[in-house]
């Protein structure tokens, strides 16, 4: 298990149920880097934080998965959490 994966999980586990739901919805439309696909909506909406972390890392690998997670958190107004996530992955 990598540092970035742990940091993603830590961030997602700190979201309220309502925020996690919003995170998933934003993930469905967040701008992606070229060459990356979108996690299918059906699979996404029922996932808990641990399953979502696994899916993010399998789809986007650790480095980009962490960056993408941080960007979605920023889109949600959670800049502090995004900064903590990125700081943890760059330690």
């Amino acid at each position: 298990m990598g540092r970035a994966r742990d940091a993603i999980l830590d961030a997602l586990e700190n979201l309220t149920a309502e925020e996690l739901k919003k995170f998933k919805l934003k993930l469905l439309s967040v701008p992606l880097r070229e060459g990356y696909g979108r996690i299918p909506r059906g699979a996404l909406l029922s996932m808990d934080a641990a399953a979502l972390t696994d899916k993010l890392v399998s789809f986007y690998l650790e480095t980009y998965g962490a960056e993408l997670t941080a960007n979605v958190l920023r889109d949600m107004g959670l800049q502090e959490m995004a900064g903590q996530l990125q700081a943890a992955t760059h330690q």
Partner: antibody, heavy 114, light 107 residues
Framework: QVQLQQPGTELVKPGASVKLSCRAS?????????????LEWIGNINLSNGRTNYN??FRAMATLTVDKSSSTAYTQLSSLTSEDSAVYYC?????????????WGQGTSVTVSS | NIVMTQYPKSMSLSIGERVTLRCKAS??????VSWYQQKPEQSPKLLIY???NRYTGVPDRFTGSGSATDFILTITSVQAEDLADYHC?????????FGAGTKLELK
């Protein structure tokens, strides 16, 4: 188009407090603008869960609260001085990505004077 | 805090001119930059978000570009109604910060 409702003017004495209101939704920001100056972000509050963020510069003087039942955000500004005479805007972030301030109230002009 | 530096502070121009307004962030802010237009005695209005996304209803003569630390707002052919103050702002980190603004005036 969403309209953010703010009262127009407030006249307060030095050292006093004022509570500004804004009918809004989602994340509501408060922004200060002194005459002829730029924009300064005071802080924001999430109307659905009450989560707040403050600019440290304003943390001692500004308190952000929300009344969910009326979808109203408030900022209480305390121990006011002449430097606090400004227009105070509320703004919402409703665009799904990049967290811009896409809806702005008309602003409340606060004059601090004895 | 992230400092947003805007330049020039003011510009005098003629109708129909092409205008380039610049905004520099003191550190990498990705694409988390917005541009706002503010006319006298009015509240700011969102023009561009995410560095390059034109907001609903904004004329296509307004174009945003840039990423990381350097950002540009271009107005391809300035109209009389574009004479206003323009503010850039970042939403990458708290506290959210704005530039001091650029004033567009008529020559």
């Amino acid at each position: 188009q969403v309209q953010l409702q703010q009262p127009g003017t407030e006249l307060v004495k030095p050292g006093a407090s004022v509570k500004l209101s804004c009918r809004a939704s989602g994340w509501t920001h408060w922004v200060k603008q002194r005459p002829g100056q730029g924009l300064e972000w005071i802080g924001n509050i999430n109307l659905s869960n009450g989560r707040t963020n403050y600019n440290e510069k304003f943390r001692a003087m500004a308190t952000l609260t929300v009344d969910k039942s009326s979808s109203t955000a408030y900022t209480q500004l305390s121990s006011l001085t002449s430097e606090d005479s400004a227009v105070y805007y509320c703004a919402n972030s409703m665009v799904p990505h990049f967290f811009p301030m896409d809806y702005w109230g008309q602003g409340t002009s606060v004059t601090v004077s004895s | 805090n992230i400092v947003m530096t805007q330049y020039p502070k003011s510009m005098s121009l003629s109708i129909g001119e092409r205008v380039t307004l610049r905004c520099k962030a003191s550190e990498n802010v990705g694409s988390y930059v917005s541009w706002y237009q503010q006319k006298p005695e009015q509240s700011p209005k969102l023009l561009i978000y995410g560095a390059s996304n034109r907001y609903t209803g904004v004329p296509d003569r307004f174009t945003g570009s840039g990423s990381a630390t350097d950002f540009i707002l271009t107005i391809t052919s300035v109209q009389a109604e574009d004479l206003a103050d323009y503010h850039c702002g970042q939403s990458y980190n708290y506290p959210l910060t704005f530039g001091a603004g650029t004033k567009l005036e008529l020559k």
